[in-house]
């Protein structure tokens, strides 16, 4: 049994880091493998993660962490029984993938304006809470070419757009994702999408 693709990990900079790797053949990850991780610091504790299958030869493990600070560094040991398959380290602050925003809502009751709001995925006491910016993706269910991205570079988790910038009388979907420049993070996963019917009054043309 060998590791074909070494573990790569990302942290949500809150409580979970996710590590993925591939073995050289079909593996029952949860019965055959264990990923041990330990904070490199005084009197730290070794933890064991039981991986799950992620495709035939792929494994994924969700490492629970009580808190994350920028200096944190973890040792990682991948074991198959008594055999050490791989040894490495992981610094969560250098591999951050934020949590996905939630509760995306489209408010259509404001006159000819669409107000999209969503929830910041972090509690106020988390460092990332005040450092997230967002991308909102809006697309038409009827026209695949009608696909747009709005970058929200301010902290407030909301976006206002004129309903007239979208076609009237058709259904649209929206989703949102987050990233944090301060840690040069990757983008989060997209939030679940939400659907609405776009309709607005055409401006009266005077001749």
């Amino acid at each position: 049994m060998k590791v074909l693709q070494e573990p790569t990990c990302v942290s949500d900079y809150m409580s979970i880091s996710t590590c993925e790797w591939k073995m050289n053949g079909p593996t029952n990850c949860s019965t055959e493998l264990r990923l041990l991780y330990q904070l490199v610091f005084l009197l730290s504790e070794a933890h064991t993660c039981i991986p799950e299958n992620n495709g035939g030869a792929g494994c994924v493990c969700h490492l629970l962490m009580d808190d994350v600070v920028s200096a944190d560094n973890y040792t990682l040991d991948l074991w198959a029984g008594q055999q050490l398959l791989w040894k490495g380290s992981f610094k969560p602050s250098e591999h951050v993938k934020p949590r996905a925003p939630g509760n995306l809502t489209v408010h259509t009751n404001v006159s000819d304006t669409l107000l999209l709001t969503w929830s910041n995925p972090y509690p106020p006491d988390n460092y990332l809470y005040n450092h997230l910016t967002y991308a909102v993706n809006i697309w038409s269910e009827n026209d695949p070419a009608d696909f747009r991205i709005y970058n929200v570079t301010y902290l407030e988790p909301s976006l206002r757009i004129a309903a007239s910038t979208l076609k009237s009388g058709i259904s649209y979907r929206a989703r949102v994702r987050a990233w944090a420049q301060c840690y040069n993070t990757t983008w989060s996963e997209w939030s679940p999408s939400t659907k609405w019917h776009n309709s607005y009054r055409e401006p009266f043309e005077q001749h």
């Epitope: 330990q38 005084l42 730290s44 504790e45 009580d66 600070v69």
Partner: antibody, heavy 119, light 107 residues
Amino acid sequence: QVQLKQSGAELVKPGASVKMSCKASVNTFTGYNMHWVKQTPGQGLEWIGGLHPGNGDTSYNQKFKGKATLTADKSSNTAYMQLSSLTSEDSAVYYCALTTAGRAWFAYWGQGTLVTVSA
Amino acid sequence: DIQMTQSTSSLSASLGDRVTISCRASQDISNYLNWYQQKPDGTVKLLIYYTSRLHSGVPSRFSGSGSGTDYSLTISNLEQEDIATYFCQQGNTLPWTFGGGTKLEIK
């Protein structure tokens, strides 16, 4: 809410030993470290050392090696510190303080145990 | 050992004031700087850890900042219950060491 309950004040003679306790109201004691801190008017706060109750690992301030011995009883979520060969210099308030395992900040503190060394 | 210096041993301020308490380390401590509050009855509480992280349950009027060797604790709107002695502590290098404390009093 985590609470640390320390044993009561001690009046001891020079040359004697004293053992104080600190009981933690936590679910899994083994996920924490228990540290001890000395406070005197002259020296202020001094870190004595810490213990991982799960595996018994300890770390001591060199200044207190041979003076303090840290132990724990996992079954009762209780940590102990024994001070030996007491002198008047050991008269102080001693605090137990809890950190999450491997952390350098004392998240919760006991109320303190006053030790007075006097003939 | 790393020396932690709180140059102001006592400080008088009025209720509602913005108060800043400073702490200097004798060498770089890489943000491993924590702040504690000790009430007159001896009760000690963690306020700020790792330079600027607010410990759970601590009012948001407390904040911390700094880097390298220089750090500070700020109380943005002083309240009566904040009357206490404040200690800094470094957790970067063994043995962990504390500052001498800054006693905060009401004018």
